[in-house]
């Protein structure tokens, strides 16, 4: 969490951003909040990116002002206009790409004063893993697949019964570059599994951590998966 304060003659206002991550090929949100003003027409929101000459986005007098917008962001950005009055200056970014990563500044002017805060935006790819029993294998084998990750993640297997066990000797992980030549498909195979046990396939990079669980019994197979973004620090 980054909290910034305004400077100069006018009073300062508190602006708060949260470091976040964008999944390439999806829309992303860059979070920013500020002390609200009672008049929308008095609020100016400017988003800037380090190393970029033009503005990322500008909103003032209750509407978008995009004449100074950098070409890199043309047609891709939006603030939540109906939420600006309550202090939400968050930016929506369409079709996030690797090149969108960097340091952004959320700069706010209201009748109360000015303030700004920086935001570190990471970009990559992350997806939910799916764990299945591989019936084609000669021994009981589990196959964990996740369609797109970047940067290359680590894959670790764990088991409920053998807690703390190291499965690196009985697993094999491969990374296959996807057609767009950026993200990769992750496939990890775990050998010699036993029934009546729950296994977890954990995939992690510096952006996200995802886990796929599978419980195999003689009568049924239960699956569960979840994903969490890492590094969501507020400023």
């Amino acid at each position: 969490l980054i909290i910034g304060f305004g400077i100069s003659g006018r009073h300062s206002i508190t602006v708060t951003t949260v470091a976040s991550a964008g999944n390439i090929g999806e829309d992303g949100i860059l979070s920013c909040t500020f002390e609200p003003d009672i008049k929308l027409s008095d609020i100016v929101i400017q988003w800037l990116k380090e190393g970029v000459l033009g503005l990322v986005h500008e909103f003032k007098e209750g509407k978008d002002e995009l004449s100074e917008q950098d070409e890199m962001f043309r047609g891709r950005t939006a603030v939540f206009a109906d939420q600006v009055i309550v202090g939400n200056a968050s930016l929506r970014l369409k079709n996030v790409q690797l090149t969108d990563a960097g340091t952004y500044k959320c700069y706010i002017i209201t009748s109360k004063g000015k303030g700004n805060a920086n935001l570190e935006y990471k970009t990559g790819a992350f997806s939910m893993p799916e764990v299945n029993v591989d019936y084609n294998a000669s021994s009981e084998t589990l196959r964990c697949e996740a369609p797109r990750w970047f940067p290359q993640p680590t894959v670790v297997w764990a088991s409920q019964v053998d807690q703390g066990a190291n499965f690196s000797e009985v697993s094999n992980t491969s990374f296959e570059l996807n057609s767009e030549n950026v993200t990769m498909k992750v496939v990890s195979v775990l050998y010699n599994v036993t029934i009546n046990n729950t296994y977890s396939c954990m995939i992690e990079n510096d952006i996200a951590k995802a886990t796929g669980d599978i419980k195999v019994t003689e009568s049924e197979i239960k699956r569960r998966s979840h994903l969490q973004l890492l590094n969501s620090k507020a400023s």
């Epitope: 995009l66 043309r74 047609g75 891709r76 939006a78 109906d82 369409k94």
Partner: antibody, heavy 116, light 109 residues
């Protein structure tokens, strides 16, 4: 040359299924938001489905649960699987690329007629 | 759900005249996510304007877009014979993800 070519349209009975294809050339489908948009005879444009660069999909309420958008990255091709077709699905179906700022590349369209 | 309402439904003008087409949204739309398209009979639509005011590649400068919030305008400064067609505005980003206006037919007077 950047191009989209649709195929797979035709006459189908109500309740039937059809799969539309859209072959792309000159750009990589999986890097863009790819859409299906339809136009009923004498009517306006209606958005049908999107597949994001990530592979996630979304569809209009009118086709949810019946139509499925997908892509084959190795063939650089977009698909629309249409099930439980109704008379009101009769339209010209276009695939279109949204290159961040608008649907800048469209196919020529393929006609789907649902009639008994 | 955002509804885009275009007016007029039909606009009858002569070549050389100025055309002003309106698109009104039922709630605020980001300027970045507002586009205009032209469609001629038997053809696919063509992107004219994106980001409310930026001309797409190859679009003549007689076409211009303006507006913000809920009111957007497409202006054709001096009509050429090939400009007579149907024009659609379109927004991105709300539910449904993409919405088109019902269209304005620009016909020769």
């Amino acid at each position: 040359e950047v191009q989209l070519v649709e195929s797979g349209g035709g006459l189908i009975q109500p309740g039937g299924s059809l799969r539309l294809s859209c072959a792309a050339s000159g750009f990589i489908v999986s890097r863009n938001y790819m859409n299906w948009v339809r136009q009923a005879p004498g009517k306006g444009l209606e958005w049908v489905s999107v597949i994001y660069g990530s592979g996630r999909t979304d569809s209009a309420d009118s086709v949810k649960g019946r139509f499925t958008i997908s892509r084959d990255n190795s063939k650089n091709t977009l698909y629309l699987q249409m099930n439980s077709l109704r008379a009101e699905d009769t339209a010209v179906y276009y695939c279109a690329r949204d290159a961040d700022y608008g649907m800048d590349v469209w196919g020529q369209g393929t006609t789907v007629t649902v009639s008994s | 759900e955002i509804v885009l309402t275009q007016s007029p439904g039909t606009l009858s003008l002569s070549p050389g005249e100025r055309a002003t087409l309106s698109c009104r949204a039922s709630q605020s739309v980001s300027s970045s996510y507002l586009a205009w398209y032209q469609q001629k009979p038997g053809q696919a639509p063509r992107l004219l304007i994106y980001g409310a005011s930026s001309r797409a590649t190859g679009i003549p400068d007689r076409f211009s877009g303006s507006g913000s919030g809920t009111d957007f305008t497409l202006t054709i400064s001096r009509l050429e014979p090939e400009d007579f067609a149907v024009y659609y505005c379109q927004q991105y980003g709300s539910s449904p993800l993409y919405t088109f206006g019902q269209g304005t037919k620009l016909e020769i007077k």
